[in-house]
Amino acid sequence: ASVGLPSVSLDLPRLSIQKDILTIKANTTLQITCRGQRDLDWLWPNNQSGSEQRVEVTECSDGLFCKTLTIPKVIGNDTGAYKCFYRETDLASVIYVYVQDYRSPFIASVSDQHGVVYITENKNKTVVIPCLGSISNLNVSLCARYPEKRFVPDGNRISWDSKKGFTIPSYMISYAGMVFCEAKINDESYQSIMYIVVVVGYRIYDVVLSPSHGIELSVGEKLVLNCTARTELNVGIDFNWEYPSSKHQHKKLVNRDLKTQSGSEMKKFLSTLTIDGITRSDQGLYTCAASSGLMTKKNSTFVRVHEKPFVAFGSGMESLVEATVGERVRIPAKYLGYPPPEIKWYKNGIPLESNHTIKAGHVLTIMEVSERDTGNYTVILTNPISKEKQSHVVSLVVYVPPQIGEKSLISPVDSYQYGTTQTLTCTVYAIPPPHHIHWYWQLEEECANEPSHAVSVTNPYPCEEWRSVEDFQGGNKIEVNKNQFALIEGKNKTVSTLVIQAANVSALYKCEAVNKVGRGERVISFHVTRGPEITLQPDMQPTEQESVSLWCTADRSTFENLTWYKLGPQPLPIHVGELPTPVCKNLDTLWKLNATMFSNSTNDILIMELKNASLQDQGDYVCLAQDRKTKKRHCVVRQLTVLERVAPTITGNLENQTTSIGESIEVSCTASGNPPPQIMWFKDNETLVEDSGIVLKDGNRNLTIRRVRKEDEGLYTCQACSVLGCAKVEAFFIIEGAQEKTNLEHHHHHH
């Protein structure tokens, strides 16, 4: 039956050579005429190649619907099926022509240097190597290498067919890298092209969905899910999908093979599920299955469908975050929303930008939290479609484990004269404030270096049993004062003081402060000496560039060989509970200093003078004296602090103010600096002089104007000056009201 014209019954086209197979010799002419009942066309071997320039198809001279195919000087490669057919139908007549070319018995596929055969290693699979022959009855064998093996047709599973090629069970050549066919003609061997052997299989490596998770859409949007199966080569794949609304009318499925790089041992298949206008009923689990017949693999993902775009905070969103100094803080913005919101963080109303210390994204991360990070953080979520906004405030509280602020924490402490009353102080800074500060003590000799104790440089005191200060038996009489609270350097600190009534015994004292996030401790070496005594001349802490003398006074009848040393830099204690090194037991760290000796009737006085003191002169100074009788060394330590020179500054502003006649004005001007600045007052740029109505107190810090008059109105300036310069603040005082006439007090005071 005709495909093109079903109403007309057509006979098959008629060929001039009425044979199924024609055998002709090479270099002869092939000519076949085809006649029919409608338009005809010819198909011939390799007619997609350049060889058709040799092929002539001409209309017959003697009638309609007739075409002659002519190939002069045929070659072996012209072997194959010649087909005459009615256009746009399946009706055709075919003749198979062998062009016997004994010099090339195999038909070379056009432009091929080599071919590829894909095989599996399975025993029940056969493979066809397509070495077609130009001669039908050739004696053909298959050569495989390496190692070299030859396979000969066995009348069963191994065979050669000139129209098909060489058939062999695939496992027999699965070891080989390449195969070719070989024909023997009159003791001459002829080879086909090489075929590279590629072993393939059925295995599916994995099935991957994309997007793989967290798929959220709102009603009406398009869902596109890609399912990719990666397989061995030469695998065919069936895909199937399972999803909530399988009867969906807007569903579209497209399956296709994906191109993989040449040389890849893998094939990729893709199935795409598209749902155009998604509805709430499409929410649910979407599963893609890929199957090769011997292996099925599946993967699933959940698709969430929202009624409309929205944004809200999740129930787990915190309102209070507590952290300890130095920790990494993570505050996640827990939200529900579609599409994902834009997230912006603010601290006390100021937008936060990410840098090396802070990352402001889905999670606010503070790398190493410090006290200044305490505050209120606002996170604002904005839905990118609806522009709906939601905000939430998180309070961050940063806790500080107790820190004990005395400088002596990291250096040996002064020696104390026998019998004196002494006060030891621990100033603790902690958030929250310490819930207790406890004092402990231990006799110095119980902690002294003994050969039996293993003592490290970092922990020189093998102190084990600290005793509570309530139990001062065998030690100094002690009284612990009630904790006081002080604002120091702008911070609320807790000050604990321990009073030693009489310094009789050398001991170690430890204060320990504990709050909810940690503990801090300080060990004070309380070395009592009957030996030399150190005094400072003048008796105050020097400032840079001032001169100071350290006097070491010792009873001449008891001591000799007075020497001044400075303690060299020590490794700072690294661990909580580390103790300062006992100075006299470690003379290696001392530097000898030049000094001048004076004597009076009973004492030797060794004076070490520091002219133009600098910050480098700060440190611990040690006076060493030797007992004349026992030759035992006594040492006394004095910590010298050199104050930095600081230019004057005035804290607090002088406020402009309005006052009525007859009232009083009181203002203060607090200045700081080193050396301490001198304060002077000016009115309208003239020096203000004290009299009965104008009182300056506390080193001119406080100015009082009693019973003000109209003339007191003006610009008042407080100026603080030292050798390092001046600072000043100004305020305008306005005096209101009518002047009362009185002769009692014409006190006014302007020069």
Epitope: E121, N122, Y205, G236, L294
Partner: antibody
Framework: EVQLVESGGGLVKPGGSLKLSCAAS????????MSWVRQTPGKRLEWVAS????????YYADSVKGRFTISRDNAKNTLYLQMNSLKAEDTAVYYC??????????WGQGTTLTVSS | DIVITQDELSLPVTFGESVSISCRSS???????????LNWFLQRPGQSPQLLIY???TRASGVSDRFSGSGSGTDFTLKISRVEAEDVGIYYC?????????FGSGTKLEIK
């Protein structure tokens, strides 16, 4: 609950034909590869045939190739095995099995085929 | 085809003791993806086979942790600790590395 129920077994003369069915329930049939496995009277298990989820790809054991055809009807949740040119050595209990990742994770209770003259 | 051998046809055992069932393959079942494609099945008397272990050592869902699989590329062992009455039946191993997938001849676990 996953259930596979085979049917269609019986006594057949050598050279005869028979069609086995396997009704599946309790899972989405079209999402799983399916196979037939037989157990000989000597209790040996032998894989017979497999089919892909859509039915496009089929595989057979050498011993049945050209005689047996595996097919499926996903609309009816049913797997089939058409057996032609039956031989005495085809006598066995035939199981249908569900396959995932190549593993036969659920098996039916089996149906018996006896080929004898 | 890959030949799977189970040497012990029968293995008598006492309740409460541990037992090991062996299986050998004519070719390595270690595939290039690093996985070993060997499965174990149990067929209880009068029932159909049930998957116990896949990929040599992974227990199928619902399988007791008394069952454990181990092995190399060609030699495999199924260990059952503290044998119970419900463990009686024929144990088959199966390879999945190459088609056709082949089964061992089975080892019958019976009570002494």
């Amino acid at each position: 609950e996953v259930q596979l129920v085979e049917s269609g077994g019986g006594l057949v003369k050598p050279g005869g034909s028979l069609k086995l069915s396997c009704a599946a329930s309790g899972f989405t049939f079209s999402m799983y590869g399916m196979s037939w496995v037989r157990q000989t009277p000597g209790k040996r298990l032998e894989w017979v045939a497999s089919i892909s989820i859509g039915g496009s790809y089929t595989y057979y054991a050498d011993s049945v190739k050209g005689r047996f055809t595996i097919s499926r009807d996903n609309a009816k949740n049913t797997l089939y095995l058409q057996m032609n040119s039956l031989k005495a050595e085809d006598t066995a209990v035939y199981y249908c099995a569900r396959e995932l990742d190549g593993n036969y994770d659920y098996w039916g209770q089996g149906t018996t085929l006896t080929v004898s003259s | 085809d890959i030949v799977i051998t189970q040497d012990e046809l029968s293995l008598p055992v006492t309740f409460g003791e541990s037992v090991s069932i062996s299986c050998r393959s004519s070719k390595s079942l270690l595939y290039k993806d690093g996985k070993t494609y060997l499965n174990w099945f149990l067929q209880r008397p009068g029932q159909s086979p049930q998957l116990l272990i896949y990929l040599m050592s992974t227990r199928a869902s619902g399988v007791s942790d008394r069952f454990s699989g181990s092995g190399s590329g060609t030699d495999f062992t199924l260990k059952i600790s503290r044998v119970e009455a419900e463990d009686v039946g024929i144990y088959y191993c199966q390879q999945l590395v190459e088609y056709p997938f082949t089964f061992g001849s089975g080892t019958k676990l019976e009570i002494k």
